[in-house]
Every structure is written in C-alpha cells, then in structure tokens.
C-alpha cells in the first residue's frame, strides 16, 4: 500500500478520506486504527455502525469520528481539535470476520498553527507546504507518498 500523508493544523479539524471499491467491500464494516510502534499492532480507534446499512451514520470515539459512504466507496475519518499527540501512522480497514484488509495507510502530521499572532494576510494552508519534495499532491491537505520514493520503516 502507498502511504498518504495528511497534514492538519493543531486545534483544527482534519478530514481523512479512504477511497475503496464499493463492490469488493460490499457489506463490510470499516475501522480506523493506529499503528503502535514500529512492529506493534494496529489499535482500533473507531469503527462504523454495527449494522452495515447504517454505516453512513457518524460514530464518535472521543475526538475521532467515522462515516462510510458505502455506495460511493469512501470512508471518511474526522479528527477534531487536532493535537500533536494525534500525529502517527494509521490505517483505514475493511473488516470481515476477525480479519481486516488495509484500505489505506495514512500518516497524520500535526503542524503548529502558522496564523498564531500573525496577520490574516499571511494566510497559509498545509497543502501549500513546500516540505514534501518527494511527494505529489493528492488534495489540499494530503500528499501521497509512493512506496519506493522514500524507504518506509518496516511494519508487521
């Protein structure tokens, strides 16, 4: 899997989208988990509604929400009031029985608010950051890093 980097600003909300094949994953619940350590497990943060037909209903766990557009094939995770400790490697998963398929690996980065004590004329967006010289822009707040472009640490 490619790893997609989503940058958010501390104190603000960040939306992470995970597209998938709606036919292949028909009837499957989805989940959002966080990779613990370099070789650790992916710890479940939040999952979609127990009834797959109600997957469009937003479910919260603390400051993290999940909702699934099962027809369009897009899982959306919202991280509200982003904080530095939210930075990390996550996965969008498709569940079937006790198994989980990875839909997307997501690296969340939490940036300091560049507008603190500054004029609105200095308006800046994470997507305009020039720090991702090895990546191509996927949309305004994420950049997709292709495997092979940068050596990614091993995961179990």
């Amino acid at each position: 899997h490619n790893t997609t980097v989503f940058q958010g600003v501390a104190g603000q909300s960040l939306q992470v989208s995970c597209p998938y094949d709606s036919m292949k994953h028909w009837g499957r619940r989805k989940a959002w988990c966080r990779q613990l350590g370099e070789k650790g497990p992916c710890q479940r943060v939040v999952s979609t509604h127990n009834l797959w037909l109600l997957s469009f209903l937003r479910r919260w766990n603390g400051s993290t929400a999940i909702t699934d557009d099962t027809l369009g094939g897009t899982l959306t995770i919202t991280l509200r009031n982003l904080q530095p400790h939210d930075a990390g490697l996550y996965q969008c998963q498709s569940l079937h029985g006790s198994e989980a398929d990875t839909l997307r690996k997501v690296l969340v980065e939490v940036l300091a608010d560049p507008l603190d004590h500054r004029d609105a004329g200095d308006l800046w967006f994470p997507g305009e950051s020039e720090s991702f010289e090895d990546a191509h822009v996927e949309h305004s707040i994420s950049r997709s890093l292709l495997e092979g472009e940068i050596p990614f640490p091993p995961t179990s």
Partner: antibody
Framework: QVQLVQSGAEVKKPGASVKVSCKAS????????IHWVRQAPGLGLEWMGW????????TSAQKFQGRVTMTRDTSISSAYMELSRLRSDDTAVYYC??????????????WGQGTTVTVSS | DIQMTQSPSSLSASVGDRVTITCRAS??????LAWFQQKPGKAPKSLIY???SLQSGVPSKFSGSGSGTDFTLTISSLQPEDFATYYC?????????FGPGTKVDIK
C-alpha cells in the same frame, strides 16, 4: 545503538546563515521525528521545531518561522537545520534530538552532542 | 504558550538523600511531560516520558508522577553522578516548552 552525531562548531557574522547537520545511526531514520532544540549560554532549553524524515514535513515554533529551515537526506540518514538572518542572541548550542515515538510525537529519547554556534561581528 | 515552572530553582543535597523536584504547567497537559538531566557542557539526557515512564537504560532510582498541571521527579537516593540540572518539558501543545531548570548541587 541509537546515535545522533552533529557537525562542528561554527562562527558566523550577524545577518549570515548557519546550517547544522545531524547524522543518525543505529535505527530506521525515516521512522522517527527529529527535533531541534537550542540553549543560549547559561540559559535554559528552547524548542525550535521538528522534521519528519519520512515525509520531509516540518513545523516550527512561531518565534523561528520564516528564519528556520529543516531538511533531511534519507540516503545518508541526516537531518539539517538552517537558521538565517543570524543575530547575536542566536549564539547558542544547537541540539538535534530523536523523538521516541514511531512516526509520532512522544517526547525525545536520544540527543546529539550539540553544535556551538557563535554569532559575532 | 504554555508556561512551565519548576521549584525549587536550586537545591543542595547530600549523597543518599531523597530529592523531589516539582514542575507545574500553566494549563493542563495530561501526561505529555518529559524530564531531562543535564550536566555542564553536555547534552541533555532523557530520563522520563509520559510523566512517569522511565526511558530505556535509566536507573529505577528516578521516578516521575503527576498529570494535568502538577508533576514531580523523584530521585530516591541521590548519588554523586546525579548532581546536575533537571528540566521538565511539555509536548502537549505547540510550541513545546521547557521549565527553567532545577540545579541540584552538593550540600
């Protein structure tokens, strides 16, 4: 073992720039953030910012935004911090430090030996 | 910015003493707090992260506690190599900030 080795001392004139390097060994460089912290003579520690060596993403303290540039070269497991428009009060020891969290911010665990930067006309 | 204060700013103690240093944050930081030891002319050494977790290789005479705004670092039995300056740091909110330090010297 995990080690961070920094470049040697620098003497710069006001208005100039300085670039400090930090070479990592003993771990997967792209898996752990690198922070930059400085310490002026006889004073405490001041956090400057971090770079994520995997993505190249950076953030910095408001105080340094526009003056500090953090980069990395994954091929040689090195991180760099460049500070521009130097002033005399930038005279300090500059440290790099690895974050202990896997692609996360969990607090630093290993520090470089420090690089003394002196700004004097 | 979150202000970190430490008390005392300095203390004199004898070998074998139990030493407690306090760190206070100007607002709640949960347990996102680290402690460092620094000796003159040397780089800081990480002792504790997440308020109470000991870094690998750090002796168990060091312990940390606290959550929210009030934290403590305790050295159960001071040894000659422990005379140094100790700093706390919060990494809950940008910018990450350090306390002013507590210097522990020989009585």
């Amino acid at each position: 073992q995990v080690q961070l080795v920094q470049s040697g001392a620098e003497v710069k004139k006001p208005g100039a720039s300085v670039k400090v390097s930090c070479k990592a060994s003993g771990y997967t460089f792209t898996g752990y953030y690198i922070h930059w912290v400085r310490q002026a003579p006889g004073l405490g520690l001041e956090w400057m910012g971090w770079i994520n060596p995997y993505s190249g993403g950076t953030t910095s303290a408001q105080k340094f935004q526009g003056r500090v540039t953090m980069t990395r070269d994954t091929s040689i497991s090195s991180a760099y911090m460049e500070l521009s428009r130097l002033r005399s009060d930038d005279t300090a020891v500059y440290y790099c430090a690895r974050d202990g969290g896997y692609l996360a911010l969990y607090g630093t665990d290993v520090w470089g030996q420090g690089t003394t930067v002196t700004v004097s006309s | 910015d979150i202000q970190m204060t430490q008390s005392p700013s300095s203390l004199s103690a004898s070998v074998g003493d139990r030493v407690t240093i306090t760190c206070r944050a100007s607002q709640g930081i949960s347990n996102y707090l680290a402690w460092f030891q620094q000796k003159p002319g040397k780089a800081p050494k990480s002792l504790i992260y997440a308020a109470s977790s000991l870094q690998s290789g750090v002796p168990s005479k060091f312990s940390g506690s606290g959550s929210g705004t009030d934290f403590t670092l305790t050295i159960s039995s001071l040894q000659p190599e422990d005379f140094a300056t100790y700093y706390c740091q919060q990494y809950s909110t940008y910018p990450f900030t350090f306390g002013p330090g507590t210097k522990v010297d020989i009585k």
